[in-house]
């Protein structure tokens, strides 16, 4: 079974979570207008 998200027991969902998408600057220029 795959790893779960969206629960406090998961380390990826801990309070250290920035909540931010990657938003890489080198990719933004490729986005469709």
């Amino acid at each position: 079974s795959e790893t779960t998200t969206g629960t406090s027991s998961n380390s990826s969902q801990s309070t250290s979570n920035s909540g931010l998408a990657p938003n890489p600057t080198n990719a933004t220029t490729k986005a469709a207008g």
Epitope: T5, S12, T15, N17, S18, L20, P22, P24, A27, A32
Partner: antibody
Framework: QVTLKESGPALVKPTQTLTLTCTVT?????????VSWIRQPPGKALEWIGY???????RYNPSLKTRLTISRDTSKNQFVLTMTNMDPVDTATYYC??????????WGQGTTVTVSS | DIVMTQSPLSLPVTPGEPASISCRSS????????????LTWYLQKPGQSPQLLIS???TRASGVPDRFSGSGSGTDFTLKISRVEAEDVGVYYC?????????FGGGTKLEIK
């Protein structure tokens, strides 16, 4: 248990300013995550409005940026969305949702806002 | 902005049968730094708020039945339901959680035949 709940006026007039509040329970809004505002016009898809991070920093959708302010009240564990110059096309259900680094994992129930004279 | 395109628009399915929803993005959602695809799936049941199903293209959220699975990479993604149940009705949305502004697909309405 994490919960988010939106509140605000159901009806606003064109050109008026909309103020919505998102009250969070189950975690401290200064401890992590972002909270985004997302809207959904009747029968249509979802549109991301903007977020406020646990640090207080904000980011807005460029299509709405000039009309938006997202702020917070840490003492009340609340976020506030202010949208100026409302128009009938802004009629929608407005949601607040907690953002992780990969998704919106908790959503509010939504509040329906109608813009009409 | 990244454009998210879903198909089909409507999906009538017989209970117990499989279902598949496609989502395409106008640019790659694969982040080179961590090799993850920042593609998320949500289900909005009638009269309810959206709920998280799958993040990082294939990681099921807590409590989501294993009949739901996500796959794909880059710009082409798929949500599959192995055996549709009556409770699965609603509108399915894909979303890119990669570059701001975050954007959603137009939705796929799953209905029971």
């Amino acid at each position: 248990q994490v919960t988010l709940k939106e509140s605000g006026p159901a009806l606003v007039k064109p050109t008026q300013t909309l103020t919505l509040t998102c009250t969070v329970t189950g975690y401290s809004i200064t401890s992590g995550y972002t909270v985004s505002w997302i809207r959904q016009p009747p029968g249509k898809a979802l549109e991301w409005i903007g977020y406020i991070q646990y640090t207080g920093s904000t980011r807005y959708n460029p299509s709405l940026k000039t009309r938006l302010t997202i702020s917070r009240d840490t003492s009340k564990n609340q976020f506030v969305l202010t949208m100026t110059n409302m128009d009938p096309v802004d009629t929608a259900t407005y949601y607040c949702a907690r953002g992780t680094t990969a998704s919106f994992d908790y959503w509010g129930q939504g509040t329906t806002v109608t813009v009409s004279s | 902005d990244i454009v998210m395109t879903q198909s089909p628009l409507s999906l009538p399915v017989t209970p117990g049968e499989p279902a598949s929803i496609s989502c395409r993005s106008s640019q790659s959602l694969l982040y080179s730094s961590d090799q993850k695809n920042y593609l998320t799936w949500y289900l909005q049941k009638p009269g309810q708020s959206p709920q998280l199903l799958i993040s990082w293209a294939s990681t099921r959220a807590s409590g989501v039945p294993d009949r739901f699975s996500g796959s794909g990479s880059g710009t082409d993604f798929t949500l599959k339901i192995s055996r549709v149940e009556a409770e699965d009705v609603g509108v399915y949305y894909c979303q890119q959680y990669f570059i701001y502004p975050l954007t959603f697909g137009g939705g796929t309405k799953l209905e029971i035949k």
